[in-house]
Amino acid sequence: DAHKSEVAHRFKDLGEENFKALVLIAFAQYLQQCPFEDHVKLVNEVTEFAKTCVADESAENCDKSLHTLFGDKLCTVATLRETYGEMADCCAKQEPERNECFLQHKDDNPNLPRLVRPEVDVMCTAFHDNEETFLKKYLYEIARRHPYFYAPELLFFAKRYKAAFTECCQAADKAACLLPKLDELRDEGKASSAKQRLKCASLQKFGERAFKAWAVARLSQRFPKAEFAEVSKLVTDLTKVHTECCHGDLLECADDRADLAKYICENQDSISSKLKECCEKPLLEKSHCIAEVENDEMPADLPSLAADFVESKDVCKNYAEAKDVFLGMFLYEYARRHPDYSVVLLLRLAKTYETTLEKCCAAADPHECYAKVFDEFKPLVEEPQNLIKQNCELFEQLGEYKFQNALLVRYTKKVPQVSTPTLVEVSRNLGKVGSKCCKHPEAKRMPCAEDYLSVVLNQLCVLHEKTPVSDRVTKCCTESLVNRRPCFSALEVDETYVPKEFNAETFTFHADICTLSEKERQIKKQTALVELVKHKPKATKEQLKAVMDDFAAFVEKCCKADDKETCFAEEGKKLVAASQAALGL
């Protein structure tokens, strides 16, 4: 499928609107500090060049790869060295090393100001004044803050963002209409970003085989009626799409994702009975819908797995002939029978099966050796089941905020070297597993909870990788992708940690806390809780609870006071002294 001009090919496939949007996302994800106007200028230049190639594919430079064209364009940025430091060294390299270099400099936690939402009337005026610029700004601001956001999905978010403004800016109560929609998009966007970040980490840190194994398990759960060959084809295509997006090849990624959606809809009879509604939607909605589609019903009367994978005399022969195909079939057969298991559990089972075959197929009596392999699965299945049961009970007892606090204490004690903002962010997200998953019946709890926890722990891993401070975090993050959660669960209090020096400034609060939203106020209190544990890692739950209750009462009291600032100053000193005494600081 060779084209004389790759840039012309993609422009013709995607159209100018999508071409420009995707190039903007790509550039903003690479050069995260560049001003909006600079990116728009670069995008317009690339687009005009692409149009000359559409008109004549033999024109000068039209035969160059997209990486070469885009990299050359990024390297024209005058302030590259002063804004990005050593990233400027990438420009001295040749492709493909130059693109790899840009990828390595993507920053998961860029030093960018928090996005402040303007007044609704201000936003509506900006929207009406120039819809095109308004949408481009949205793409730019999200892409630079989320450098691995799944680009074709970001187009879908932008479409919904636009629809919200179109509807709400003509509503009687604009704010009541718009703000909940924007909140929903923000929350969904953060979740989408984190899910895609795990896919990219899986591909980049653990390789294509790891991603394909994940995809086989997930697609087999979702499409249990599909044949193994069909699932394998979907896995191959999906791997290509995500490899491209994670590699910064956003035009190819969006194009291939559209092709995959088209294929799935044309072949839905042999894939899933649940796709009908999705396939009636326009492209972006269709692709999103397919990605989120519910699991199809399992075929009736599926035979026991043991026959082919334990009892058969041909197990070692089949394994030796094509190891990954045989393991893929095992994973497919197990996953389609177990929509009640998390993907990571299914992958642990497949790994155990593989390890057993590696050992047993070299033994004197292979069959005797692997006959009890399924017995080894029992503890692997029970461990997440028990963990989820215990934590859901705790969540139901405490509610989300206090459940988050319990996790904050737990994780700060495990890895106290990790920065406080990271511990707060990650523990808050871990705590959301309760409201997200505990409401589900037993059969849906594990896939919801453990696969969500994989996404959240990956956030910890990528943030920690930027500035590594804990060998224990590094170990859990790098040893095994599927065992990250059990690895973190197994960590006990870090006995080697030297408690942090007490600093009264950390526990000094001001009247500005009173005007914060409930969420922001929670974050302030949770930040203080982490700092408290860092000072006194051996503090008991009861001690910490007492201090936090006093702290909550102190904030409530001073926020009701006439002279708030004086109250915070005077009562704050008393609280610090009382807390020090209570904790023996």
Epitope: G15, E16, E17, K20, A21, L135, L155, L283, L284
Partner: nanobody, 130 residues
Framework: HVQLVESGGGLVQAGGSLRLSCAAS???????RAWFRQAPGKEREFVAA????????YYTDSVKGRFTISRDDAKNTVYLQMNSLKPEDTAVYYC????????????????????????WGQGTQVTVSS
């Protein structure tokens, strides 16, 4: 081959309204849809366009504020709501599908050259009497 079919044209008095429709025979997700018009003895000119992904509208200066372009994803159809019609709006109105977007003019309106669209409809007559 994609076919574009226009409907909704007719005779209307000045100040009146008409709504044109353009249905596509097939999904062409990545193409902007546009309306052009050609008055007797004049060249075909751009009127309005809407992008397919985000639904961003573009208008030529002379119709801004009077005409509204919209789309229905599910029906694969584009509409041109024409209000406050003037005799100078009399023309054959053509629907088109274009990979390219309109470009901004110095006056702040938009234009799209007639060589840009990949697909054209047959046209529908709009006559505005004074």
């Amino acid at each position: 081959h994609v076919q574009l079919v226009e409907s909704g044209g007719g005779l209307v008095q000045a100040g009146g309204s008409l709504r044109l429709s353009c249905a596509a025979s097939d999904t062409i997700d990545n193409y902007a849809r546009a309306w052009f018009r050609q008055a007797p003895g004049k060249e075909r000119e751009f009127v309005a366009a809407i992008t397919w992904t985000f639904g961003t509208p573009y208008y030529t200066d002379s119709v801004k504020g009077r005409f509204t372009i919209s789309r229905d994803d599910a029906k694969n159809t584009v509409y041109l709501q024409m209000n406050s019609l003037k005799p100078e709006d009399t023309a054959v109105y053509y629907c088109a599908a274009s990979l390219y977007l309109p470009v901004r003019t110095a006056s702040g309106g938009y234009r799209l050259d007639t060589d840009r669209p990949q697909y054209w409809g047959q046209g529908t007559q709009v006559t505005v009497s004074s």
